[in-house]
Interface confidence: low
């Protein structure tokens, strides 16, 4: 046997090179046949009228042919025949890789509510061989469950991901990434999660700046409520009492001018959206008017939570004066 061939792997749409090589040549006819045993080339003569076949080289020791725009229907055994006595035949197998035609991601719900489990599906259509699908939420890899469907030598892979969403997932991409021998680099598609969550309420004292409230001073509190959808209603109430007559409510802001000891109490900002409602409390303690001693430096910290009560105690240097409990978020 002095007729040799090599197997070829090619990506659909690209060029395959088929070579029939003869070791000891005696100018015998070399012929190349397709899988249907139709002649593609007889020496440098092409009886097959498929212009995708082009002669790259013809000599007594080689017949080299290129097949452009390869399709899956070109896959199979190509026979080289050498017309010696007796005739020799050798075959080369063309394997065609087909990248997925389409990569589709489908989220069960456009908008999810925090704590909910949603189903995300990714389909890589009509590839050969079957595609491997990987899932990422942001930079974190997740585990999906894949199903492979075969049709006419092509594979459609569907991967299912069950995902429990949290408010931190809002705006985070869910990425379906494909791994396939015909794909170089990253082939991926993504959808951004939209997660609805109940408001987080936080009270900010915008006046006085040093955080110490004294008789005769003004107080300004701003209620910050963040949720999805954005809360439409932000309301101020005084817990267990009427709002002072001289209190002014303006949207998320509460103004109390000319503070006096009767204003002491808990002021609550309430916010709600379609997911739920939440509130944050501010405990006002009005101090005596200042003496000539300059006020101490004070710090205010507020933390929002729905389960833990955080008390921030602000004190000054005068003995016997009570601490002021400032803000509690719920």
């Amino acid at each position: 046997q002095n007729l040799f061939t090599k197997d070829v792997t090619v990506i659909e749409g690209e060029v395959a090179t088929i070579s029939c090589q003869v070791n000891k040549s005696d100018d015998s006819v070399i012929q190349l046949l397709n899988p249907n045993r139709q002649t593609i080339y007889f020496r440098d003569f092409r009886p097959l009228k498929d212009s995708r076949f082009q002669l790259l080289n013809f000599s007594s020791s080689e017949l080299k042919v290129s097949l452009t725009n390869v399709s899956i229907s070109d896959e199979g055994r190509y026979f080289c025949q050498l017309y010696t006595d007796p005739p020799q035949e050798s075959y080369t197998t063309i394997t065609v890789l087909v990248p997925p035609r389409n990569l589709m991601i489908d989220i069960q719900k456009d908008t999810a509510v925090e704590g909910e489990e949603i189903e995300v599906n990714c389909t890589a259509m009509a590839s050969k061989p079957a595609t491997t699908i990987r899932w990422f939420k942001g930079n974190t890899e997740l585990k999906g469950k894949s199903e492979v469907e075969e049709w006419s030598d092509m594979y459609t892979v569907t991967s299912q991901l069950m995902l429990k969403v949290h408010k931190e997932d809002d705006g985070v991409p869910v990425i379906c990434q494909v791994e396939h021998p015909a794909v170089t680099g990253n082939l991926q598609t993504q959808r951004y999660l939209e997660v609805q969550y109940k408001p987080q309420v936080h009270i900010q004292m915008t006046y006085p700046l040093q955080g110490l409230t004294r008789e005769g001073d003004a107080l300004e509190l701003t209620c910050e409520a963040i949720g999805k959808p954005q809360p439409v209603m932000v309301t101020w109430v005084r817990v267990d009492d009427e709002m002072p007559q001289h209190a002014v409510l303006s949207g998320p802001n509460l103004f109390i001018n000319n503070l006096n000891k009767t204003d002491n109490g808990t002021y609550r900002c309430e916010a709600s959206n379609i997911v739920g409602k939440a509130h944050s409390d501010y405990m006002l303690y009005v101090y005596d008017p200042p003496t000539t001693i300059p006020p101490p430096t004070t710090t205010t910290t507020t933390t929002t939570t729905t389960t833990t009560t955080i008390l921030t105690i602000i004190t000054d240097s005068r003995a016997g004066e009570e601490g002021s409990i400032r803000a509690v978020d719920h």
């Epitope: 006819v29 012929q31 046949l33 045993r37 139709q38 002649t39 007889f42 020496r43 440098d44 003569f45 092409r46 009886p47 009228k49 498929d50 212009s51 002669l55 013809f58």
Partner: antibody
């Protein structure tokens, strides 16, 4: 000088088959691709298929696929065209036509040499 | 299949005229086009192959041009022997002929 000589006229009944021959002389038979082209009365030319005699591999026009068989006998340098399931529309002059390899510049079935034609009449 | 459309179907001209016949392919066939002349009761005769190459023995008044989908056959100065039917033929994908153009004496 290459010559293609065809068999004589035929009269056939609808549903039957006809086999026309074409003998090549004046050259090496293996140098040819032999095609069959037909021409109905007053009509244009229609390529039916072709064969490379040395290998016996044939290609057919889609219209005739399954109804036409083209073969070659290398020992007698003769090509044959058999058309089955004849109907009246198959009444035509059938030409064999040869195209000769021009080395690497040969790219398809165009025809430098033609036979004299064979009239096939399909009639009840 | 590739369809070949010739125009005109019939052309009347006089000796000495310059004549052009057009052939259009339904898809690109590169330059794989041949032109034939056929006289009544005779087999066709190859004039041009590969769109513009003149077959040996064919008079130089015949010329071909074009590529892709548009092709023309030109006879620079008609001779009495040129009145016949002309066919274009693509051989990019097997073979298909045009429907023919009959060149008549005006």
């Amino acid at each position: 000088q290459v010559q293609l000589v065809q068999s004589g006229a035929e009269v056939k009944k609808p549903g039957s088959s006809v086999k026309v021959s074409c003998r090549a002389s004046g050259g090496t038979f293996s140098s040819y691709a032999i095609s069959w082209v037909r021409q109905a009365p007053g009509q244009g030319l229609e390529w039916m298929g072709g064969i490379i005699p040395i290998f016996g591999t044939a290609n057919y026009a889609q219209k005739f696929q399954g109804r036409v068989t083209i073969t070659a006998d290398k020992s007698t340098s003769t090509a044959y065209m058999e058309l089955s399931s004849l109907r009246s529309e198959d009444t035509a002059v059938y030409y064999c036509a040869g195209d000769i390899s021009r080395g690497s510049s040969w790219y398809g079935y165009y025809f430098d040499y033609w036979g004299q034609g064979t009239l096939v009449t399909v009639s009840r | 299949d590739i369809q070949m459309t010739q125009s005109p179907s019939t052309l009347a001209a006089s000796v000495g005229d310059r004549v052009t016949i057009t052939c259009r392919a339904s898809q690109s066939i590169s330059s794989w086009l041949a032109w034939y002349q056929q006289k009544p009761g005779k087999a066709p005769k190859l004039l041009i192959y590969k769109a513009s190459s003149l077959e040996s023995g064919v008079p130089s008044r015949f010329s071909g041009s074009g590529s892709g989908t548009e092709f023309t056959l030109t006879i620079s100065s008609l001779q009495p022997d040129d009145f016949a039917t002309y066919y274009c033929q693509q051989y990019n994908s097997y073979s298909t002929f045009g429907q023919g153009t009959k060149l008549e004496i005006k």
